[in-house]
């Protein structure tokens, strides 16, 4: 014969535990039903009657199967520098996260108490370690051959652009300037060419501007594409 299924409340066998989603009530000395997430125990069980559950009131919650007499209060509304990533419902607490450009400087078990702005690396410095939800940006000086010309919490040090002929060598806060146009990004005709940044993986030596055989009239102005020609000269 199949074993009979015990209905709550019931007295457990000596040495055994209550089943999943049940708890042992010390007063009644019975295995009783837990309340589901979003509910709480309105009336505790007795030897003859099971737990009576009731829904959590507004702005309160229970996240787990439980037998608590009152639901937990949701945290206070998110502050102005935070965004609500999870709303307060009967089954979950409100979660506040720092808005973009900020990180959590003081974390609590249910979210963030204090947001702080991410550090911005000034020109000549790049991001060595990006900011996360809970950690600030770490800046580092741009190594020789690399630069950052922005004040930014995301920009890394990037390599100076390659020039056919260098007009102004780059430094930690400025890209190299080429005498001949280097339209490495597509440009509209007539647009002034500004040196375009690349990134961190180069090693250069840049003492002085180099002598140029290029005509100075083409300085930083885009040229139309010209195919390789026999005996072609510089820009």
């Amino acid at each position: 014969l199949p074993a009979q299924v015990a209905f709550t409340p019931y007295a457990p066998e000596p040495g055994s535990t209550c089943r999943l989603r049940e708890y042992y009530d010390q007063t009644a000395q019975m295995c009783c039903s837990k309340c589901s997430p979003g509910q709480h125990a309105k009336v505790f069980c007795t030897k003859t009657s099971d737990t009576v559950c009731d829904s959590c009131e507004d702005s309160t919650y229970t996240q787990l199967w439980n037998w608590v007499p009152e639901c937990l209060s949701c945290g206070s509304r998110c502050s102005s520098d935070q965004v609500e990533t999870q709303a307060c419902t009967r089954e979950q607490n409100r979660i506040c996260a720092c808005e973009a450009g900020r990180y959590c400087a003081l974390k609590t078990h249910s979210g963030c108490r204090l947001c702080a702005p991410l550090r911005k690396c000034r020109p000549g410095f790049g991001v060595a370690r990006p900011g996360t939800e809970t950690s600030d940006v770490v800046c580092k000086p741009c190594a020789p051959g690399t630069f950052s010309n922005t004040t930014s919490s995301t920009d890394i040090c990037r390599p100076h652009q390659i020039c056919n002929v260098v007009a102004i060598p780059g430094n930690a806060s400025m890209d190299a300037v080429c005498t001949s146009t280097s339209p490495t990004r597509s440009m509209a005709p007539g647009a002034v060419h500004l040196p375009q940044p690349v990134s961190t993986r180069s090693q250069h030596t840049q003492p002085t501007p180099e002598p140029s055989t290029a005509p100075s009239t083409s300085f930083l102005l885009p040229m139309g594409p010209s195919p390789p020609a026999e005996g072609s000269t510089g820009d």
Epitope: G145, R158, P159, H160, I162, C163, N164, V165, V166, P169, A176, S180, T181, S182, P183, T184, R185, S186, Q196, P197, V198, S199, T200, R201, S202, Q203, H204, T205, Q206, P207, T208, P209, E210, P211, S212, T213, A214, M223, P225, S226, P227, P228, E230, G231, S232, T233, G234, D235
Partner: antibody
Amino acid sequence: EVQLLESGGGLVQPGGSLRLSCAASGFTFSSYAMHWVRQAPGKGLEWVSAISGGATTTYYADSVKGRFTISRDNSKNTLYLQMNSLRAEDTAVYYCAKGGTGDPYYFDYWGQGTLVTVSS
Amino acid sequence: QSVLTQPPSASGTPGQRVTISCTGSSSNIGAGYDVHWYQQLPGTAPKLLIYRNNQRPSGVPDRFSGSKSGTSASLAISGLRSEDEADYYCAARDDGLSGPVFGGGTKLTVLG
């Protein structure tokens, strides 16, 4: 006619050194960035290093940084690549290439290549 | 693993049109950098085929054309000939590297 002619390749033991040369003609050598590009046997192309026309600025791939040195002698129209602390993975055909007119990030002329074999 | 992605192989019969793709990212092609194409015939050095996305050097037949859109580019060869059998490489500048980056190469086979 633009011509680029590499030399100096050969067999070398791991940890050894080699110096490649590239003789250029047919264009105003000092007005252009020059590059070294390599191709391991049966593999694709890999940019190695570059140097600006006036030789003031050099550029390296991570894989060779600190081991290879690019240089040029504009009076001799010659490009060089000094390769030290060579490894088996440096085995490749090494091409010298001329930076494009107005844009040194493409190569409008290439040499025929010189084979470097790093093996014990 | 190449920064730019190309199909390892492509094929076509004489007279056909074939297209070879080159897919990059927001740090290279998508950043607005020009795409260049090289042809490497068996046992020879690479040769510039297309520069600045769609420009042909003198001496390159107009059967070869290039285009670029978004984070990808393509090389089209129309009126395929047996002498077009070669490896084709795309290349572009990349915000994350000091020199140009190449695709892994596409081996084009002319059938028949």
